[in-house]
């Protein structure tokens, strides 16, 4: 018995179709991805193949404007306009809370959202009982198929889930699950959930009677063959892990942002065990023409947007510095309030021995794209935003050793003077420099501010300990140079989407008024 | 609006066959799964299996397998349950209803009472 | 195969009076759970489903609750056109399994 599994995951908010770097879509004829297109292609391989399944791993939430204006409602319309089988919750569902997620997408999706380790306490328990599922048993063809999800169990650290959700481990909350679903008979199980690929991995691995792991969280491309775009596959699609007891599970996941589609062949024997797996996930090109009913859909919700972009969010009532000859030479106040920007979107009380779990921001000045006049009655629109972080970025959370930091720190004045990227912003930490030393060896002081305290203060950088980041994706991608933090990252967890962070905290403070306030010295 | 028509009822002979169609309207037939349910006079319902109306993909209950056939027609949009080698046993009202985006049943057909009757 | 039992299998009621029917199901069925009212010579009607959504057009004065493997509907404020027999249904795996039924009589 063959079953075809179709799967998306971290898509982002990425409802239209976009560049090839998934950014705003600029050259129609390049451009890839989009909800009218994948719906083409799932609709043409549900006509060809009799039993198909169409899986997302998480992370719809989160990414473009389309998520600031609608807060789910998109997701949930547009997912069910593709008739997708199964969700599995991400981290970055609870982005707005819990009942940013029950309102939006658990009350209007028209499929199952699932996942096994999220247990509700107090309160909530009544409220959000059967919205989520730990599991679903569908009917495929002439079979059952059981579905069981999981969700990232460091949620509480990188999303806003509230006091009322425990997440457990994954393995010890899957188990007991997919016994039960052997019990009753269900022998082809799928585990599909949002914790990376290490821990999918894992999970092949441990979780007896897993047949097959339809990831997310860490955006893994994986490919056979010659890869048919920029990305470079982790490993062949499906990646094969032999679990404990010999079965031999494939493991797939389909890179991020609606690119692709995961496409994964799978033959069963009759008693539910795996026979063969192979696939690819499909470039969703402009070769695949965007479906028109969904298209036209698209531009009707697309109205909305337009007219968001240029209402107010807030006041400055200080010119917001954020020309290159600033940020790119000194302390500017722009990075000044994109990085408390990013902290502020970071605070998480999850233990009373900390204020909170990460105190630091980094931020390329090259990466701020444009100032800030306060003298247009001080008003600041998502517009104005969208032209200082105009990439469509992310601000993402990461791990760190304090050696890693330093060396980027000398490598953020190793050239310095000559109104390059990577000259970093900072929030959080001091920094001297004494550019009268040689490249390498320029930083005379760094302290940052310390988490593990009732009264934050600034301590000397120790160069072993390990600790938490907020920066833009594309230094933790190892961007201008900053290779050290791509090889030496310890963790790394995708943020939410950059001009969102920094339109909520202006729409919170309501009126700014950053200062250049001596975070960065020169000696 | 959503309905489900079956046809009259039926008084057969042991040992014979019957078809029962269940003509759906008011939705897109393949968008949703029929199920096919069992009550005897007097008793509880009893589940019998499930179709898909797109690729006719069906799923029955152990105790009915040999006993049903489950079939669609998707240019009529028509549902349709074969009951075969019918004994007294067999004697109830059948009810086709279709299921939601949950596969929980919604919408129900109004029956088809089925004797067998020598 | 999962056993739903429910209860009381009769029970008599006044106008205007709060009622409660449960189920329970033989081990946890994950809000699985379907409610359905039927009339003498009438089809079965879905009142609920997922344990506590109602289905489109059926009144306010019908709830369902529960999870794991007890369930129960209310009728907020008993109608004459609610009496019947109710029937609970587990969906959450196959083969689907009904409860036996509660007869609601009027008092």
């Known amino acids: 018995w063959e079953l075809t599994i179709l799967h998306t995951n971290d898509v982002h908010s990425r409802l239209e179709q976009t560049s090839e770097d998934s950014s705003k879509c600029v050259n129609a004829s390049r451009c890839m991805g989009g909800v009218a297109r994948l719906f083409t292609k799932v609709q043409q391989i549900r006509r060809a193949e009799p039993n198909v399944l169409l899986l997302d791993a998480g992370d719809q939430y989160q990414g473009t404007i389309w998520f600031t204006v609608y807060k789910g409602a998109e997701v949930a319309h547009f997912m069910n306009a593709l008739r997708y089988d199964a969700m599995a919750l991400g981290n970055h569902e609870f982005d707005n809370g819990v009942e940013g997620l029950i309102e939006p997408l658990l009350k209007e999706a028209k499929f199952p959202i699932l996942s096994a380790n999220i247990k509700a306490k107090g309160p909530l328990a009544s409220q959000i009982s059967g919205l989520y599922l730990p599991y679903k048993v569908l009917p495929v063809g002439d079979e059952v198929v059981g579905i069981v999800g999981y969700t990232s169990k460091e949620t509480p650290f990188l999303s806003n889930p509230g006091t009322n959700l425990v997440f457990e481990d994954e393995i010890t909350a899957l188990q007991p699950e997919v016994d039960k679903l052997k019990t009753l008979n269900v022998n082809k199980i799928i585990a599909l959930g949002h914790s990376g690929f290490e821990m999918d991995k894992l999970i092949a691995q441990k979780v007896r009677g897993v047949d097959v792991v339809v990831g997310g969280h860490s955006n893994t491309f994986l490919y056979t063959g010659n890869p048919p775009s920029k990305e470079v596959p982790a490993g062949k699609y499906p990646f094969i892990v032999t679990s404990d007891d010999g079965r031999k599970v494939p493991v797939v996941q389909a890179y991020a942002f609606g690119k692709y589609l995961g496409y994964l062949k799978i033959e069963f024997d009759e008693r539910g065990n795996v026979i063969s797996s192979h696939g690819n996930p499909i470039l969703l090109n402009s070769s695949i023409p965007e479906d028109p009913s969904i298209k036209a859909d698209i531009n009707k919700w697309r109205i909305k947007l337009d007219n968001y972009s240029t209402q107010e969010l807030g006041k400055t009532i200080v010119y917001l510095d954020g020309s290159s000859q600033s940020c790119r030479f000194r302390e500017c106040n722009m990075g000044n309030l994109i990085c408390d920007a990013m902290i502020n979107n970071n605070l998480r009380h999850t233990d009373e021995m900390f204020w909170n779990h990460v105190s630091m921001c980094i931020l390329n000045g090259g990466g701020i794209r444009s100032p800030i006049d306060e003298r247009n009655n001080g008003t600041i629109t998502w517009e104005n935003l969208a032209a200082v972080l105009p990439f469509g970025g992310t601000f993402d959370l990461v791990q760190l050793k304090g050696s890693t930091l330093k060396k980027a720190f000398e490598h953020s004045v190793h050239r310095y003077g000559q109104s390059t990227g990577e000259f970093l912003q900072v929030g959080g930490i001091h920094v001297v420099y004494d550019l009268s030393r040689k490249p390498g060896d320029r930083v005379v002081k760094l302290d940052v501010l310390c988490t593990k305290c009732r009264v934050p203060s600034y301590d000397p950088l120790k160069m072993d300990e390990v600790y938490k980041v907020i920066l833009p994706n594309f230094l933790a991608n190892g961007g201008d140079g900053f290779q050290m933090i791509k090889d030496e990252l310890l963790r790394h967890d995708s943020g939410d989407q950059d001009i969102n962070v920094v339109s909520t905290y202006i729409s919170k403070m309501k009126v700014i008024y950053p200062a250049v306030e001596g975070r960065i010295k020169f000696s | 609006q959503v309905q489900m028509k079956q046809s009259g009822p039926e008084l057969v002979k042991p040992g014979a066959s019957v078809k029962i169609p269940c003509k759906a309207s008011g939705y897109t037939f393949t968008d949703s799964n029929m199920d096919w349910v069992k009550q005897s006079h007097g008793e509880s319902l009893e589940w019998i299996g499930d179709i898909n109306p797109n690729n006719g993909g069906t799923i029955y209950n152990q105790k009915f397998k040999g006993k049903v056939t489950l079939t669609i027609d998707k240019s009529s949009s028509t549902a349709y349950m074969e009951l075969r080698s019918l004994t007294s046993e067999d004697t109830a009202v059948y009810y086709c209803?279709?299921?939601?985006?949950?596969?929980?049943?919604?919408?129900w057909g109004q029956g088809t009472s089925v004797t067998v009757s020598s | 195969d999962i056993q739903m039992t429910q209860s009381p299998s009769s029970m008599y009621a006044s106008l205007g009076e709060r009622v409660t029917i449960t189920c329970k199901a033989s081990?946890?069925?994950?809000?699985?759970l379907s409610w359905f009212q039927q009339k003498p010579g009438k089809s079965p009607k879905t009142l609920i489903y997922?344990?506590?959504r109602l289905i489109d057009g059926v009144p306010s004065r019908f709830s369902g609750s529960g999870s794991g493997q007890d369930y129960s509907l209310t009728i907020s404020s008993l109608e004459y056109e609610d009496m019947g027999i109710y029937y609970c249904l587990q969906y959450d795996v196959f083969p689907r399994t009904f409860g036996g039924g509660t007869k609601l009589e009027l008092k």
């Open positions: 081990q946890d069925i994950n809000s699985q």
């Open positions: 997922r344990a506590n």
């Open positions: 209803a279709r299921t939601n985006w949950d596969y929980a049943m919604d919408y």
